[in-house]
Interface confidence: medium
């Protein structure tokens, strides 16, 4: 599973990330959620085959003939900067819900440069898909220096 | 059964470094999603998240007292372990080590360390 | 990065119901989890409620849990309250992968 470490939009605009997979996830479900802590994470987004499925401002979708699917995150606002993941592949782990696959974005939201007028048609950031490791540092150091390494990592779901 | 024991040094003088080590069971740190973090508590005032480690060696700090913190684990003994460098009267507290779950964290009873010279 | 924060002291009666309250100051009280914990006198911190809302096996069911967008709030109500009651609370979230602390209610 691959994809981009960190995104960044302005606020007001629209922005979508492309995460690539394996033919073996094919058929798998795929997920968007916020990261709260290592093996935890809210605001599940869940699509399953090539459906489209809406959360709020969030859209998933799967593209499995070209092996990617898309999430689009509408209207952001500041309070949407956090730490996302993409995920494929679900599998028990210690009796709890865990992803086999998986990587975080950490998202930056800016303001918009012009706050006066009201805004356009809404702007959509170009889809990265940088090759990353499904293990190894995914994110560096954070600016506020809490974090030591930063591995792509796994979570349990509620 | 999950359970945690701290252990310290009890009193230790200013600008010495304290090693606090936490003995667990009932889980291991080489399976996936396992954690083990460090609380303390001053006495009679709150919590105060001072670090966690993963199951895959991922360290977390608290961002206030980073350069001070040293997480570290040792997983075929089923233990996880903090230094704090440079201690002051300001560290003296009870520090609990916890095991987050997604049922919220499983808490050791507590060592009280004093710093005092 | 936000603070969560507590009364200090919140006095009820025994058989009311009391309602202690978590305010986050920045950012949506719904965008991370929220855990509650009771701590009685010298003991260590047990977890009442967790992610949000829900009660771990053994937590009566007097305990409950929940989120008051309208006022960036997570609320842990206690129905029936009794003697044993009567203890430290605090709230806790996460933010990118730390923990945060409330300053802790304490309940008389």
């Known amino acids: 599973l691959h994809g981009p470490s960190t995104m960044s939009g302005s606020v007001g605009e629209s922005l979508s990330v492309s995460c690539r997979y394996e033919e073996k996830f094919k058929t798998k479900d795929k997920y968007w959620c916020r990261v709260s802590l290592k093996i935890l994470c809210k605001d599940i987004v869940k699509t399953s085959s090539s459906e489209e499925a809406r959360s709020g401002r969030v859209t998933i979708r799967d593209h499995p003939d070209n092996l990617t699917f898309t999430v689009t995150y509408e209207s952001l606002t500041l309070e949407d900067a956090d730490t996302y993941m993409c995920a494929v592949d679900i599998s028990l782990f210690d009796g709890s819900l865990g992803f086999d696959k998986y990587f975080k974005i950490e998202l930056s939201v800016v303001p918009s440069e012009d706050p006066v007028s009201s805004p356009g048609p809404t702007l959509e950031t170009p889809v990265v898909s940088t090759s990353l490791p499904t293990k190894g540092p995914a994110l560096g150091s954070n600016t506020e220096g809490h974090r030591e390494h930063d591995y792509s990592q796994g979570l349990r779901l509620p | 059964e999950v359970k945690l024991v701290e252990s310290g040094p009890g009193i230790l003088q200013p600008s010495q470094t304290l090693s606090l080590t936490c003995t667990f069971s009932?889980?291991?740190?080489?399976?996936?999603?396992?954690?083990v973090g460090w609380i303390r508590q001053p006495s009679g005032k709150g919590l105060e998240w001072l670090a966690n480690i993963w199951w895959d060696d991922d360290k977390y700090y608290n961002p206030s007292l980073k350069n001070r913190l040293t997480i570290s684990k040792d997983t075929s003994n089923n233990q996880a372990f903090l230094k704090i460098t440079n201690v002051d009267t300001a560290d003296t507290a009870t520090y609990y080590c916890a095991r987050p779950t997604t049922e919220g964290d499983y808490w050791g009873q507590g060592v009280m360390v004093t710093v005092s010279s | 990065q936000f603070v969560l924060t507590q009364p200090n002291s919140v006095s009820t009666n025994l058989g009311s119901t009391v309602k202690l309250s978590c305010k986050r100051s920045t950012g949506n009280i719904g965008s991370n989890y929220v855990n509650w914990y009771q701590q009685h006198e010298g003991r260590s911190p047990t977890t009442m409620i967790y992610?949000?809302?829900?009660?771990p096996d053994g937590v009566p069911d007097r305990f409950s849990g929940s989120i008051d967008r309208s006022s960036n709030s997570a609320l842990l109500t206690i129905n029936n309250v009794q003697t044993e009651d009567e203890a430290d609370y605090f709230c806790q979230s996460y933010s990118s992968g730390m923990y945060i602390f409330g300053g802790g209610t304490k309940l008389n």
């Open positions: 009932g889980f291991s740190l080489s399976t996936y999603g396992m954690g």
């Open positions: 992610r949000d809302d829900k009660r």
